[in-house]
């Protein structure tokens, strides 16, 4: 087992909130059995850890929010993997169980004497994790112990089912909405024949299912649908790309309800197989505007249209984060590892020096270099504030006129906290209203992004539209520059005058061959030719029949 996973970030407090962030990438296929995590992550990992620590500092220094109560935290690494996250969640639960036993005076030493040892405070709620599949597994465990969970990026539709996931809430909308947005984009550009790819796991599977259902209702055909694991090997991605290629040149558009690393796997396979420019990827919010998806594979990603949950950058987070340094940041146990990975150098002489790097980190290095804030930062912070406001409301109702934790609130009852959380309504970090519907979901608005070549060897994401409450707005000129550039993704072109569609057995309804009607036939509907009755003949536009005018022959008429 990987020791890095057992590292925990602590911040003391009267009430402890748990958090699961993907501080490291998920284990590769060959390392899954050992649960050995991958490389350290900045946006999804370190930034979120720092957001938790700093947001709690801000909450604790706000005299109007939880006065006389200090919020602390215990942050663990989910590695974007169910087995790892479950293992870490069990640690949260264990803390709670030990604490509740201690409350009941059950803590005893091996020799039978009573213990003066104070165990850790129980976790009252959990923030995260990021992945839907992982969040489901974690929720299955947490709800057994009445521990509310607030997610900041788990968007699977399944999680709306309160009969299954009672203690789950989220500050993001359900994926049903972005599936609709993706279908609306496909419709807008008359792409009637597209390939589909999704990441194996709940996020991809339920999202793609919704996309396919909505597509069918709109007359959009799926050439073929494929699924792949995010951590699949090169061979699997190459095989998938070859299958997608088999649908060219007809299915040029590939709708990808995918996690970011799945998209990256596709881009890398495109590079290996020399397929840059062959496809247009339409990506879900797992891709959004992430540079860690496209870095090094920009040529392959060009033209990609992606869905991004609307969440503006949080300025005060950058003001805090960009000043962090490895020699002074001791409360984040992953920070030195991250610093070395980020700058590809070793923190020579530090206890966590990574000898795989030869170069010593210069003291002039700064996080300002190539800084990109996590695109879901606002949601992470809103999730933390939601927990704080929920606790605040609970304290107000259980301890009226009392500052601090009163006896009625000790130990914190998860059922009452859930009730209080569901009623939470406050102004979020970006000025938006944060509230939860009966399913614990939040309303959402999406931005439509386009990955473009902005100049020679300079690529970036451009905001080209929005999807809000069922309404799609797109700046077509920004995406295509001129109408003739709009990519076509159709199986068959419309039939010419006098032709009907013949759909071959086993083919989807968007694929046909055009067959002309016989000389005496007209086009009855797009699939049928009908013969004109005796005495009538097809009209010029071949859409009906006209009576043949009767011509009487006279003796003097020339031979026809």
């Amino acid at each position: 087992q990987s020791s890095e996973r057992r590292v925990v970030a602590h911040m003391p407090g009267d009430i402890i909130i748990g958090a699961l962030f993907s501080v490291h990438h998920q284990p590769t296929v060959d390392k899954v059995h050992e649960r050995k995590c991958g490389a350290v992550r900045e946006q999804y990992g370190i930034q979120r850890v720092e957001a938790m620590l700093h947001t709690l500092e801000r909450i604790n220094s706000d005299p109007t929010l939880l006065p006389n109560i200090t919020l602390g935290c215990e942050i663990r690494d989910s590695c974007w993997h169910s087995a790892v996250a479950l293992e870490q969640s069990i640690e949260f639960i264990r803390d709670s169980l030990i604490s509740s036993e201690e409350e009941e005076g059950l803590v005893r030493c091996v020799d039978g004497s009573s213990s003066s040892f104070r165990s850790k405070k129980p976790i009252v709620g959990v923030i995260g994790p990021g992945s839907s599949s992982v969040a489901i597994q974690v929720q299955n465990l947490l709800q057994l112990f009445n521990i509310p969970q607030i997610a900041y990026s788990a968007t699977s539709m399944d999680l709306s089912d309160k009969t299954l996931f009672k203690y789950f809430m989220r500050v993001v909308p359900s994926d049903a909405q972005q599936a609709r947005a993706m279908v609306d984009i496909v419709k807008r550009y008359n792409w009637t024949y597209v390939s589909a790819v999704h990441t194996e796991g709940n996020y991809g599977e339920s999202g793609m299912e919704a996309f396919k259902d909505m597509s069918a209702k709109e007359g959009i055909c799926i050439a073929h649908s494929y699924k792949i694991y995010s951590n699949a090997g090169e061979q699997s991605f190459d095989k998938l790309l070859k299958k997608l290629t088999s649908h060219l040149p007809k299915a040029r558009v590939v709708a990808c309800f995918c996690e970011g690393m799945t998209v990256r796997g596709l881009l890398m396979a495109m590079r290996r197989l020399g397929l840059a420019g062959e496809f247009l990827l339409l990506g879900s919010d797992g891709w959004a505007d992430r540079y860690d998806v496209t870095d090094g594979y920009q040529r392959e990603a060009v033209g990609g249209i992606t869905i991004k949950l609307q969440s503006p950058d949080v300025k005060w987070f950058d003001d805090y984060y960009l000043k962090l340094r490895p020699e002074t940041n001791h409360r984040n146990p992953w920070f030195q590892e991250f610093w070395q990975h980020r700058f590809q150098c070793r923190l020579e002489g530090f206890p966590q020096e990574n000898s795989k790097y030869n170069k010593t980190c210069n003291s002039s290095l700064t996080l300002k270099t190539h800084h990109v804030q996590d695109s879901k930062m606002g949601f992470v912070i809103n999730a933390i504030y939601s927990m704080a406001y929920g606790l605040h409301n609970m304290q107000m109702s259980l301890c009226p006129g009392y500052a601090g934790l009163c006896d009625a609130m000790k130990p914190i009852d998860g059922r009452k906290l859930l009730e209080s959380l569901m009623k939470t309504n406050f102004t979020g970090v970006s000025g938006d209203t944060i509230l939860f519907d009966e399913n614990g979901d939040s309303p959402g608005r999406y931005e439509i992004m386009n990955f473009k070549e902005m100049g020679k060897d300079y690529f970036d994401y451009i905001n080209v539209g929005s999807w809000d409450n069922g309404e799609l707005k797109m700046d077509d000129d920004e995406v295509w520059s001129k109408k003739s550039n709009i990519i076509r993704s159709v199986c068959s072109e419309p039939c010419e005058k006098g032709q009907i569609k013949v759909i071959r057995k086993g083919e989807v309804s968007c694929c046909w061959t055009c067959t002309p009607c016989k000389e005496n036939e007209y086009v009855f509907d797009e699939y049928t030719c009908k013969a004109c009755q005796l005495g009538s003949w097809p009209t010029d536009d071949l859409t009906g029949c006209d009576l043949i005018p009767v011509q009487y022959l006279r003796w003097g008429d020339p031979e026809p």
Epitope: E327, R346, L347, G349, N358, K359
Partner: antibody, heavy 118, light 109 residues
Framework: SVEESGGGLVKPEGSLTLTCKAS?????????MCWVRQAPGKGPEWIAC???????TYYASWAKGRFTISKTSSTTVTLQMTSLTAADTATYFC?????????????WGPGTLVTVSS | DIVMTQTPASVEAAVGGTVTIKCQAS??????LAWYQQKPGQPPKLLIY???NLESGVPSRFKGSGSGTEFTLTISDLECDDAATYYC???????????FGGGTEVVVK
Amino acid sequence: SVEESGGGLVKPEGSLTLTCKASGFDLSSYYYMCWVRQAPGKGPEWIACIYAGDGTTYYASWAKGRFTISKTSSTTVTLQMTSLTAADTATYFCARGTGVGSYGYNLWGPGTLVTVSS
Amino acid sequence: DIVMTQTPASVEAAVGGTVTIKCQASENIYSNLAWYQQKPGQPPKLLIYRASNLESGVPSRFKGSGSGTEFTLTISDLECDDAATYYCQGYYPSAVTNAFGGGTEVVVK
């Protein structure tokens, strides 16, 4: 081995460039080449290091601005010194390490004497 | 900047005896300390790195210990050839900088 050259007598406010030549090994990405000076009867004083891999430089705070370390070829490193004063009179050593300092310097040149005097 | 304070400035001991030299750092430098031996007209010679690791070819009579701010070099079974000046060099990772101690002269009788 490493050997320094370029020392000698220089007037105050003058400039001088010292050269360190490595032989028997390449200045590969494994090594750091550093300059250390020692005034007569005093202890050594660290000046600067350069990482041979990509030329990243590391300086003592007092040396920044007046001293410049550079890798000029796969076997040579130089130290440019400007605005020299009598306090800069010392034997200047070139030393090799596998870091800026935490592993010590395991190969030293014999040194070259720099005298700053009018 | 980091300051390395070495004590004593001079020590005298008989052949076969033991000498202990101390070095104190003004900041926590973890285990980032090296010990050197220098004889007149020669460059320093590395004896110990990372506080306690013996450089190859150096006799095991030389022993380094300590971490944080307090470090010690112990030379046991003194030989005439050990007569030299010994310097500690501290590396301060937070500032990526080095400093040498003032030196300890060892006289062997």
